[in-house]
Interface confidence: low
């Protein structure tokens, strides 16, 4: 289990939290922050928050944007403050690269 953790870990970051899952809080602590955009019943739903454990965000953060959902992840205090996830536009290709920073 200990071998699974990143080299610099478990540094907790302060992340901006926006969306229903945040309750009354405007921040959360986690090993990764994220900013996401999804389409739900035709509406754009923006969310920001954190993954408590690195493994939680591992697959989500690696997933390339699709027409219905985009997630950008980062590591650093408040690093998701100015990140706004964007859905891919028609004709634009998105390579499946990781969007978060690992030391």
């Amino acid at each position: 289990m200990e071998d699974e953790k990143p080299k610099v870990n478990p540094k907790l970051y302060m992340c901006v939290c926006e969306g229903l899952s945040c309750g009354n809080e405007d921040h959360c602590e986690g090993q990764q922050c994220f900013s996401s955009l999804s389409i739900n019943d035709g509406f754009h739903v923006y969310q920001k928050g954190c993954f408590q454990v690195y493994e939680q965000g591992k697959m989500t953060c690696k997933t390339p944007p699709s027409p219905g959902q985009a997630v950008e992840c980062c590591q650093g205090d408040w690093c998701n403050r100015n990140i706004t996830a964007q859905l891919p536009t028609k004709g634009k290709s998105f390579p499946g690269t990781q969007n978060f920073h690992l030391e």
Epitope: V8, P10, K11, L12, M14, D77
Partner: antibody, heavy 119, light 113 residues
Amino acid sequence: EVQLVESGGGLVQPGRSLRLSCAASGFTFDDYGMHWVRQAPGKGLEWVSVISWNSATIDYADSVKGRFTISRDNAKNSLFLQMNSLRPEDTALYYCAKKNSLGWFFDYWGQGTLVTVSS
Amino acid sequence: DIVMTQSPDSLAVSLGERATINCKSSQSVLYSSNDNNYLAWYQQKPGQPPKLLIYWASTRESGVPDRFSGSGSGTDFTLTISSLQAEDVAVYYCQQYYSTPLTFGGGTKVEIK
């Protein structure tokens, strides 16, 4: 006013166990990661363990790994350190410390509780 | 583990004079993505717990007198007391919070000459 009050220290024989408690008040306890830091008599500071606000992330110094267990009860605003298989080198003043909201440094400390491991 | 080395071990300074404490980390504590140095300074007076003075290497904690200042980046850091007061007699510690295990310097004892 933020207050952290440790208890549970005392004289214990090598190999025995002890459970430290830290009662927190004056801040929203379940918003913050909490740490234990110790200080051997006349020596410097040594970080012991951390627990995140929701207990999802826990880590220990190598010197106590496998022997000490950190836990918390957010409903009771309490932090704990279960110390098993105690050694003479564990003799120290044990502080509980509140993590600052911006990083893993400590903006509030308790007064400490003294643990003496001796036969 | 990141090893923190403080110098000198002790320091005797006249009242009103400048006191300078050095702290060196065995590897950089500068986090490139946010340009922050993950380093804090504490003051510990006899019989008391440590008190936070400085974080992010140079940000003074609220309520800390402005005669205390922190500087440095990467691996080399300095805590300066610009004009030593009697109440500044204490042991000062640096701490890195870049990675676990969190580690402290050995401490520098500041006394009045």
